[in-house]
């Protein structure tokens, strides 16, 4: 025998109190798959969170952070203050990157400039608080037809910076 609940579509639940009739999810709840015996409560986006996507009978709400903040954690479980490029967030707030480091994003930590000499290259464009150095040609690259500029190493994913 087929389970009668398997006929209940997303957005409904199989109501045991009503002879397993498919009942619509109550307000502020949802079921994203069929055959559910209960509907899940919708996530609420309040305070530092704002609603990115409203809850519907078939899908949960999604939150992001209010302007001036960015999400941390899967599903935006926490919000952290933005800083300007050339800064990082410390326990004392947003602070400029120290000399020799940069941050080209509004989040994350200041990272050391690329050391061009490790690759036998010279500095073509100096680094700033906001930008990495651009490494120029090594002597071997000066032969005709050689590319004169190598792009900076791709930025690694910034770690979680202090509050």
């Amino acid at each position: 025998l087929q389970d009668p609940c398997s006929n209940c579509p997303a957005g409904t639940f199989c109501d045991n109190n009503r002879n397993q009739i498919c009942s619509p999810c109550p307000p502020n709840s949802f079921s994203s798959a069929g055959g559910q015996r209960t509907c899940d409560i919708c996530r609420q986006c309040k305070g530092v969170f704002r609603t990115r996507k409203e809850c519907s009978s078939t899908s949960n709400a999604e939150c992001d952070c209010t302007p001036g903040f960015h999400c941390l954690g899967a599903g935006c479980s926490m919000c952290e203050q933005d800083c300007k490029q050339g800064q990082e967030l410390t326990k004392k707030g947003c602070k400029d990157c120290c000399f020799g480091t940069f941050n080209d994003q509004k989040r994350g930590i200041c990272r050391p400039w690329t050391n061009c000499s490790l690759d036998g290259k010279s500095v073509l464009v100096n680094g700033t608080k906001e930008r990495d150095v651009v490494c120029g040609p090594s002597p071997a690259d000066l032969s005709p037809g050689a590319s004169s500029v190598t792009p900076p190493a791709p930025a690694r994913e910034p770690g979680h910076s202090p509050q």
Epitope: V48, G73, Q163
Partner: antibody, heavy 115, light 107 residues
Framework: QVQLQESGPGLVKPSQTLSLTCTVS????????VHWIRQPPGKGLEWIGA???????DYNAAFISRVTISVDTSKNQFSLKLSSVTAADTAVYYC?????????WGQGTLVTVSS | EIVLTQSPGTLSLSPGERATLSCKAS??????VSWYQQKPGQAPRLLIY???NRYTGIPDRFSGSGSGTDFTLTISRLEPEDFAVYYC?????????FGQGTRLEIK
């Protein structure tokens, strides 16, 4: 440095109103809201309510008839008022900054309700 | 409201051992669970947010896992300073709620 500090009378008589302030520094009251959370002696944590950066509030239904949370941006202070207190309201009261989880708390202040 | 139930109520272990603390939610709360450590006379301290993300400055012996209704805090190798009370809390739906706590004591 983000800091929150609760203050107020440590002793309140039954049926009176408990009034606490949370003085903050290191962040803007127009950017962050604050939650109030309490902890009766030897027990767990209980969320009372919150005031958001725009000034709107949310309260736990268990307190809604007797709680008011407000903000005074000129003094960098949030306040909690809880009316008609009983011995069951004896607790350490904390304020915590709203950042989606509670990363920054005050040190807490003990309020005893007794005649 | 969403009820969080922590177990065990008390856990007696020795330094160097592994601690496993459980938190069960009465409803699906996704991954919106945080873990806090509280020592006597102090405010709670955030350890884990979003079920599995270690907060800034928290040692990597602390880890969190789980989603939906079942969550776990693991301390891989207990240090003397880890003996305290641990609370889980949910930030999914209002009113925000906390578990009743697990006391981690020295055996």
């Amino acid at each position: 440095q983000v800091q929150l500090q609760e203050s107020g009378p440590g002793l309140v008589k039954p049926s009176q109103t408990l009034s606490l302030t949370c003085t903050v520094s290191g962040f803007s009251l127009t950017t962050y809201g604050v939650h109030w959370i309490r902890q009766p002696p030897g027990k767990g944590l209980e969320w009372i309510g919150a005031i958001w950066s725009g000034g709107s509030t949310d309260y736990n239904a268990a307190f809604i008839s007797r709680v008011t949370i407000s903000v005074d941006t000129s003094k960098n202070q949030f306040s909690l008022k809880l009316s008609s207190v009983t011995a069951a309201d004896t607790a350490v009261y904390y304020c915590a900054r709203d950042d989606g989880s509670f990363a920054n708390w005050g040190q807490g202040t003990l309020v005893t309700v007794s005649s | 409201e969403i009820v969080l139930t922590q177990s065990p109520g008390t856990l007696s272990l020795s330094p160097g051992e592994r601690a496993t603390l459980s938190c069960k939610a009465s409803e699906n709360v996704g991954t919106y669970v945080s873990w806090y450590q509280q020592k006597p006379g102090q405010a709670p301290r955030l350890l884990i947010y979003g079920a599995s993300n270690r907060y800034t400055g928290i040692p990597d012996r602390f880890s969190g896992s789980g989603s939906g209704t079942d969550f776990t805090l693991t301390i891989s190798r207990l240090e003397p300073e880890d003996f305290a009370v641990y609370y889980c809390g949910q930030t999914y739906s209002y009113p925000l709620t906390f578990g009743q706590g697990t006391r981690l004591e020295i055996k």
